[in-house]
């Protein structure tokens, strides 16, 4: 999903927290969708 | 060559905002996370966060959260670090820096102080 | 967070002799990964800090061989085997092993 900034270091080591983010961002955007869904 | 080149000193009063610009040239800016370190007078250097300039994600260190804001300009390859509710502890030299595919800080911008003073 | 403790606070040399620092960290820096990501800085006075060895022994590129790294788990030593004078200034310790990532608290190399 990031394939030029895998070549820093930077990367790898925040890799575990890159993912919990996109997680819980996308985790927060399905319950927006489902509250803008519920509102229809 | 790598070059991360930053704005000028800026002297700014208590409960202020200031905003430090770090221009990179020399590789591609979104294939590397941008840093921000700060050093206050004849004290040791302080991690303040990092940004990912290509998807935006943004890790603070605690310490900051809340007070600082990091943002970059693709279009022009510069990262910004904001520090708002300014207080005299916070009188310091402001770095950006980027790493490598083996290190943390191997290229470093030549610092901006910000003077807090009323 | 992790506290890393260098010493000496200053380290008074003699030019051509060696010199030693000391960096401790208040736990073990070993990354998940196996690698232990300890980094030593130098900066010299009104120059921003200029990386010379990573990942605890490995040199940077364009620095002189007679910087050496060492250590393993949570005591770590940077040698300087003959100290010149392009060579005083501050050295820090730096852990990027874990959030938030911390810097040592310096030692200064000096002129005895």
């Known amino acids: 999903d990031n394939p030029s900034l895998s070549i820093d270091l930077t990367f790898h080591l925040l890799r575990t927290l890159l993912e919990l983010a996109r997680t819980q961002s996308q985790r927060e955007r399905a319950e927006q969708n489902r509250i803008i869904f519920d509102s229809v | 060559q790598v070059q991360l080149v930053q704005s000028g000193a800026e002297v700014k009063k208590p409960g202020a905002s200031v905003k430090v610009s770090c221009k990179a040239s020399?590789?591609?800016?979104?294939?590397?996370?941008m840093k921000w370190v700060r050093q206050a007078p004849g004290q040791g250097l302080e991690w303040m966060g990092v940004i990912n300039p290509n998807q935006g994600d943004i890790f603070y260190n605690q310490k900051f959260k809340g007070r600082v804001t990091m943002t970059v300009d693709k279009s022009t390859s510069t990262a910004y670090m904001e520090l708002s509710s300014l207080r005299s502890e916070d009188t310091a030299v402001y770095y950006c820096?980027?790493?490598?595919?083996?290190?943390?800080?191997?290229?470093w911008g030549q610092g901006t102080l910000v003077t807090v003073s009323s | 967070d992790v506290v890393m403790t260098q010493t000496p606070l200053s380290s008074p040399v003699t030019l051509g002799q060696p010199a030693s620092i000391s960096c401790r960290s208040g736990?073990?820096?070993?990354?998940?990964?196996?690698?232990?990501?300890l980094e030593w800085y130098q900066q010299r006075p009104g120059q921003p800090p200029r990386l010379l060895i990573y990942?605890?022994?490995n040199r940077f590129s364009g620095v002189p061989d007679r910087f050496s790294g060492s250590g393993a788990g949570t005591d770590f030593t940077l040698k300087i085997s003959r100290v010149e004078a392009e060579d005083l200034g501050v050295y820090y310790c730096?852990?990027?092993?874990?959030?938030?990532?911390?810097f040592g608290g310096g030692t200064k190399v000096e002129i005895k």
């Open positions: 736990q073990s820096i070993v990354h998940s990964d196996a690698n232990t990501y």
């Open positions: 730096f852990q990027g092993s874990h959030i938030p990532w911390t």
């Open positions: 020399g590789y591609t800016f979104t294939d590397y996370f």
């Open positions: 990942k605890v022994s």
């Open positions: 820096a980027r790493g490598t595919d083996r290190a943390l800080f191997a290229y």
